[in-house]
């Protein structure tokens, strides 16, 4: 059975350029390794933002990525992307792969549109 991945359709980044959103999959398979990848879609191009593999022991991910962090619990991943600027506004897709044990399954969310608004520069004070 194919896995269904759900993520919110829209998220507004904070004034500090931080966006957080959940990525959930169902049905919940008994899986030892789950790989979660965040992809950004721009026009027809898909680029990898960050990826990590979660296990029963390793529930904190994206340690190799300064701009991504995430925690895994059962079939839900709480994703955080930081360092975002207005030019990073776009559609971010969550891909979930059940890596081990076999069989392999892949599921793709419909994407979360992240809106980033650069903060207004502070006016000079005399």
């Amino acid at each position: 059975e194919a896995i269904q991945v759900t993520q919110p359709s829209v998220v507004l980044a904070s004034s500090h350029g931080v966006a957080s959103f959940p990525c959930e999959y169902s049905p919940s398979h008994n899986t030892d390794e789950v790989r979660v990848t965040v992809l950004r879609q721009t026009n027809d191009q898909m680029t990898e933002v960050c990826a990590t593999t979660f296990t029963e022991k390793n529930t904190v991910g994206f340690l190799d990525y300064p701009f991504c962090s995430g925690t895994f619990n059962e079939s839900r991943v709480n994703l955080t992307i930081q360092g975002l600027r207005a030019v990073d506004t776009g559609l971010y897709l969550c891909k979930v792969e059940l890596m081990y044990p076999p069989p392999y399954f892949v599921g793709m969310g419909n994407g979360t549109q992240i809106y980033v608004i650069d903060p207004e520069p502070c006016p000079d004070s005399d």
């Epitope: 194919a2 898909m46 792969e97 081990y100 069989p103 392999y104 399954f105 793709m108």
Partner: antibody
């Protein structure tokens, strides 16, 4: 541009072994799952094996399980297929293919193929 | 494993005709995780469609895919001489990754 070049094919007797190689260039090899897909003469496509990004996980088609071993050397950007106990039904063109960024099971780029003939 | 069936086995058409190729999955485990490939004699296959309906990079818009669940279709709106080839569907939602037997589109 993405390029995949297979080598190592040839004529081999039943029961013998052969190792295929696939040299990859034009992309970050270690970020992609890689596959071997074969095509017997005049037949359709048959997926053989996949090795995931870091090389830790490998899956095989039932028809080759226990006889074929897929491996990769990310430092050399090279994919391998070690084939043991070859049978006549393993005769085919063997392609290496890159798994897509959207899903590792999409074969988005292919090599030109290398022919393996198992015959006595 | 998911078994894919393609029909017809051969499609004899003329340049300019519309081609409709069918692919049916034995179970809906593949969801919309279906791809189409084109293969010409002596060449490696080429990815045309993924996600049942998204065109791969560089594929002309006369190629379109549709369907979900168990029934999928590849449509070539107006056949060009270079489109005469064998077309395979493939599911990539779960392992083993399986392909259909192919549909040959040849010149009438």
């Amino acid at each position: 541009q993405v390029q995949l070049v297979e080598s190592g094919g040839g004529v081999v007797q039943p029961g013998r072994s052969l190792r295929l190689s696939c040299a990859a260039s034009g992309f970050t090899f270690s970020s992609y799952g890689m596959h071997w897909v074969r095509q017997a003469p005049g037949k359709g496509l048959e997926w053989v094996a996949v090795i995931w990004y870091d090389g830790n996980n490998k899956y095989y088609a039932d028809s080759v399980k226990g006889r074929f071993t897929i491996s990769r050397d990310n430092s050399k950007n090279t994919l391998y297929l070690q084939m043991y106990s070859l049978r006549a039904e393993d005769t085919a063109v063997y392609y290496c293919a890159r798994g897509g960024i959207l899903a590792a099971g999409i074969f988005d780029y292919w090599g030109q193929g290398t022919l393996v003939t198992v015959s006595s | 494993e998911i078994v894919l069936t393609q029909s017809p086995g051969t499609l004899s058409l003329s340049p300019g005709d519309r081609a409709t190729l069918s692919c049916r999955a034995s179970q809906s485990g593949s969801s919309s995780y279906l791809a189409w490939y084109q293969q010409k004699p002596g060449q490696a296959p080429r990815l045309l469609i993924y996600g049942a309906s998204s065109r791969a990079t560089g594929i002309p818009d006369r190629f379109s895919g549709s369907g979900s669940g168990t029934d999928f279709t590849l449509t070539i709106s107006r056949l060009e001489p270079e489109d005469f080839a064998v077309y395979y569907c493939q599911q990539y939602g779960t392992s083993p990754f399986t392909s259909g037997p192919g549909t040959k589109v040849d010149i009438k």
